[in-house]
């Protein structure tokens, strides 16, 4: 069953009009794919390729499609029930805690610790410790060995942008 | 394969109401809206309204709100349509038809309702 | 209400020729255009969606176009079997609705 989005999760500017008391929940509502209009009788279209909703919606305007930023692949186009999926670039991933840029991939593990993880679109390598086998905090080290790794292939999104 | 199996010819008098169904197979009722539409001979099409089977959420064309009643009944994947006070404006065909929310991918074969006393 | 004109009710054409039936809006519908082939006693099937998105086993002869107010169904080499009513529906704001209509008839 769809996720509904109410009133109450929307911007002051967002939401529709008063509307008469709903006899279910989504009586009212858009389908994904759709906003309300402004008198709250009609579902208007979002348009292809510029805006999308995801959810039965009182929204009086779709959601604006996310374009991709340079470093960044289309790895699937913006629909208008689906945001674009952007995924950073081979040899680059997007942390959690950095979420609006794609970092570059350290190219090895710093000396005493060996490589457990390839670089993904959203992890950078992976090195543990020989001896303790316990991962490396993921600061960038003063010196590197010479020992490389090979990006990752992308797999799945790292983030949807929105 | 995707089916929409309509109920037969209806041939009722002036103020009564009839209730047509729509029986699915071959896909996820509760995935795809339903949509009913008129046809009356001769002429061209006219959306009546939509019913999600997935949260029943229905909408209606403002001309059919209160003249038509859509229903859902998961359990057996058929939709329904309840047309009350009958005249002979309302003598059509009604055609069943799934979808995505604005155009309709498959349809049923059609009931003809006869409104005549 | 959108309303949908079809300003042709009659084409007439031959097997082989190239046919366009169109269909103007009252207003812009931004692409959210469907057409439907309908034959005499039979149930109307859906070709095109969102103005150029040919449905599922619809032949590659038919192709949709058009933007803003202003559609196209075009029937590059037409085919006996394609005679029939061709309808135009806006998707784009409800209630949905459908053009008067086109008769394709085949020479």
């Known amino acids: 069953e769809s996720a509904l989005i109410t009133q109450q999760d929307l911007a002051p500017q967002q939401r529709a009009a008063p509307q008469q008391k709903r006899s279910s929940p989504s009586e009212g509502l858009c389908p994904p794919g759709h906003h309300i209009s402004e008198d709250g009788r009609d579902c208007i279209s979002c348009k292809y390729g510029q805006d999308y909703s995801t959810h039965w919606n009182d929204l009086l305007f779709c959601l604006r499609c996310t374009r991709c930023d340079s470093g960044e692949v289309e790895l699937s186009p913006c629909t208008t029930t689906r945001n674009t999926v952007c995924q950073c670039e081979e040899g680059t991933f997007r942390e959690e805690d950095s979420p609006e840029m794609c970092r570059k991939c350290r190219t090895g593990c710093p000396r005493g610790m060996v490589k457990v993880g390839d670089c993904t679109p959203w992890s950078d390598i992976e090195c543990v410790h020989k001896e303790s086998g316990t991962k490396h905090s993921g600061e960038v080290p003063a010196v590197e060995e010479t020992v490389t790794s090979s990006p990752g292939t992308p797999a799945s999104p790292c983030s949807l942008s929105g | 394969e995707v089916q929409l199996q309509q109920s037969g010819p209806e041939l009722v008098k002036p103020g009564a109401s009839v209730r047509m169904s729509c029986k699915a197979s071959?896909?996820?009722?509760?995935?795809?809206?339903i949509h009913w539409v008129k046809q009356r001979p001769g002429q061209g099409l006219e959306w009546i309204g939509w019913?999600?089977?997935?949260?029943?959420?229905?909408k209606y064309s403002e001309k059919f709100k209160g003249k038509a009643t859509l229903t859902a009944d998961k359990s057996s994947s058929t939709a329904y349509m309840q047309f009350s006070s009958l005249t002979s404006e309302d003598s059509a065909v009604y055609f069943c038809?799934?979808?995505?929310?604005?155009?309709?991918?498959?349809w049923g074969q059609g009931t003809t309702l006869t409104v005549s006393s | 209400d959108i309303v949908m004109t079809q300003s042709h009710k009659f084409m007439s054409t031959s097997v082989g020729d190239r046919v366009s039936i169109t269909c103007k809006a009252s207003?812009?519908?931004?692409?959210?255009v469907a057409w439907y082939q309908q034959k005499p006693g039979q149930s109307p099937r859906l070709l095109i969606y969102w103005a150029s998105t040919r449905h599922t086993g619809v032949p590659d002869r038919f192709t949709g176009s058009g933007s803003g107010t202003d559609y196209t169904l075009t029937i590059s080499s037409v085919q006996a079997e394609d005679q029939a009513l061709y309808y135009c529906?806006?998707?784009?704001?409800?209630?949905?609705?459908f053009g008067g209509g086109t008769k394709l008839e085949i020479k």
């Open positions: 019913i999600y089977p997935g949260n029943v959420n229905t």
């Open positions: 071959g896909y996820t009722f509760t995935s795809y809206f």
């Open positions: 529906q806006q998707h784009y704001r409800t209630p949905w609705t």
């Open positions: 207003q812009d519908v931004s692409t959210a």
């Open positions: 038809a799934r979808g995505e929310a604005g155009y309709f991918d498959y």
